[in-house]
Structures are given as structure tokens and as C-alpha cells.
């Protein structure tokens, strides 16, 4: 099966790599602009230079292109705890991340929020905190895991999801009646 190509990809595939077809004259292949620049004017003819201009401050292009405008630099989302790892340059977008001992939770493909890694108080670290994953804790006896924090079984009411985890403690408090769990 031949993958479906958009108009732009069809036009580009006619020219050798690193060149694109002139939008007004399909017999001319113009050289693409280097990363960090954008297309100001198409080449006037075969073998003649494309007019490329450097991106202005606050914009970038990360690969060779024939874009009429540079892309706007991303801004790190401070309200989501993001910090700037590296600033935007003409050929690279801003890189955002989280502080030390934090992990990323992605709300969508490109939008993440920074959360503090769990310390596993009243438990032990089963898996260390990673860039996109919180610490995995194993709780000590008498504690249950709630949103990756170890919480005392004294906070566990019957019929809640902690019941099975705190079953011995609940039986001690409530007596030895059969709770219907195994």
C-alpha cells in the first residue's frame, strides 16, 4: 500500500532531498532553508539561492524547512510547576521539565504537570521515582496505599477500597464477623 501523501509532500517528493518545488513553477527545485531560518522568498530560478532569513527572537525552526514564518517558542507552564531546562534558540524550542524529586503527569500529549515524588513514609520504596512515574511504595503493616501515600488503617472505614488491605485491623476492631472477602 502506498501511504497517502498531502499536496505539500507530493510536491516535495518531486525534488531531491533538501529541496522543494517552487510553488509557482513546478520545473524549479529550490534549496530548503536551514534550521534557525525561514523562507523569505523562493529561489528565482534553477541553481539560484533561496532567500532565507534568521528567525527573530522568540521564534525558531528546528529542521530544514520552507516555512513562511518561524514557530513561536513554547512557554513553560509555571502554574503546573514546570521549570525551564533550556531556553529557546533560533533552532531549538524551549525545553521544560520538573524540579528535582518531582515527576511529570501528562494531562495530554504535550501538557504535563509536576508532582512531588512520594517519600514512602510508613512504607518502603519498591520502585524509585522516575521522570514520568511516581515512586512505587509498599506500605508497612497497619497502613494502606492511597494515591501512593501510606495511610494508617485507622482511617479506613468499612466498605471502602482499603477494607481488604486493612482486613486484620478491621476485624480486630469490628469483631470476627465474616466480611465476605477472602
Amino acid at each position: 500500500l502506498v501511504p497517502h501523501l498531502g499536496d505539500r509532500e507530493k510536491r516535495d517528493s518531486v525534488c531531491p532531498q533538501g529541496k522543494y518545488i517552487h510553488p509557482q513553477n513546478n520545473s524549479i527545485c529550490c534549496t530548503k532553508c536551514h534550521k534557525g531560518t525561514y523562507l523569505y522568498n523562493d529561489c528565482p530560478g534553477p541553481g539560484q539561492d533561496t532567500d532565507c532569513r534568521e528567525c527573530e527572537s522568540g521564534s525558531f525552526t528546528a529542521s530544514e524547512n520552507h516555512l513562511r514564518h518561524c514557530l513561536s517558542c513554547s512557554k513553560c507552564r509555571k502554574e503546573m510547576g514546570q521549570v525551564e531546562i533550556s531556553s529557546c534558540t533560533v533552532d531549538r524550542d524551549t525545553v521544560c521539565g520538573c524540579r528535582k524529586n518531582q515527576y511529570r503527569h501528562y494531562w495530554s500529549e504535550n501538557l504535563f504537570q509536576c508532582f512531588n515524588c512520594s517519600l514512602c513514609l510508613n512504607g518502603t520504596v519498591h520502585l524509585s521515582c522516575q521522570e514520568k512515574q511516581n515512586t512505587v511504595c509498599t506500605c508497612h503493616a497497619g497502613f494502606f496505599l492511597r494515591e501512593n501515600e501510606c495511610v494508617s488503617c485507622s482511617n479506613c472505614k468499612k466498605s471502602l477500597e482499603c477494607t481488604k488491605l486493612c482486613l486484620p485491623q478491621i476485624e480486630n476492631v469490628k469483631g470476627t464477623e465474616d466480611s465476605g472477602t477472602t
Epitope: Y103, H105, Y106, W107, K132, Q133, N134, R146, E147, C162
Partner: nanobody, 120 residues
């Protein structure tokens, strides 16, 4: 068993308002972050907003910021989404979702959705 039941959707003209509700059961509601996501016909799930267990922290997608407000009533196990200044592009099926923090985007536990239609 986790159950989430959305309501409040309907037909509204551009510029109008709607308030969505989500009744939660089968888990300790106040312990968990909750989220609203939406899906327009033929498109993927889009995150809209999220709120912490206590309700103290709220977050919004750029596309709805300043127009939508997420809130919760933990005594009623209910999540809300107040939608103002609705636009044609807001038309979608809206789902509430129980959030599992870390990694993502993950909206494994979500309801059956409520349809919002915005048209003149």
C-alpha cells in the same frame, strides 16, 4: 466497582452556558484527583480540566481557560463543570474521569458521557 455518571449536557447557542455534573460511587471520592475530558465526533479524547481531591488545585486546557470552571462537592461525591461563553468547537461528548497520577494521559475510569451541542 467505580461508577461515574455524567449529566447536564444539551443543546445551547454560541455564547450560552451549561453546568455538567458527575455523580461518583464505588470509591472514596475525596481521595482522588478528578478530570473532565471530551471527545468531538471523529476525534480523540481531549483533556479539559482537572481538580485535586480537596478541590484546592484546579487546572485547565488553554482552549477553555477563563470560560470553564471545575469544582467538586465531596460531601455529595459530585464533580461539576461550569461552561460559559460556549463556542461551536466546544461541542463534544464530555466525560468525567478518575485520575491515576503518573505517566498519562490516562483516563481509564470514566463515565458514559453527556453530549454538549453548540449551534445557532
Amino acid at each position: 466497582e467505580v461508577q461515574l455518571l455524567e449529566s447536564g449536557g444539551g443543546f445551547v447557542q454560541p455564547g450560552g452556558s451549561l453546568r455538567l455534573s458527575c455523580a461518583a460511587s464505588g470509591f472514596t471520592f475525596e481521595w482522588y484527583w478528578m478530570s473532565w475530558v471530551r471527545q468531538a465526533p471523529g476525534k480523540g479524547l481531549e483533556w479539559v480540566s482537572a481538580i485535586s481531591g480537596s478541590g484546592g488545585s484546579t487546572y485547565y486546557a488553554d482552549s477553555v481557560k477563563g470560560r470553564f470552571t471545575i469544582s467538586r462537592d465531596n460531601s455529595k461525591n459530585t464533580l461539576y463543570l461550569q461552561m460559559n461563553s460556549l463556542r461551536a468547537e466546544d461541542a463534544s461528548v464530555y466525560y468525567c474521569a478518575k485520575v491515576k497520577l503518573g505517566g498519562g494521559p490516562n483516563f481509564g475510569y470514566r463515565g458514559q458521557g453527556t453530549l454538549v451541542t453548540v449551534s445557532s
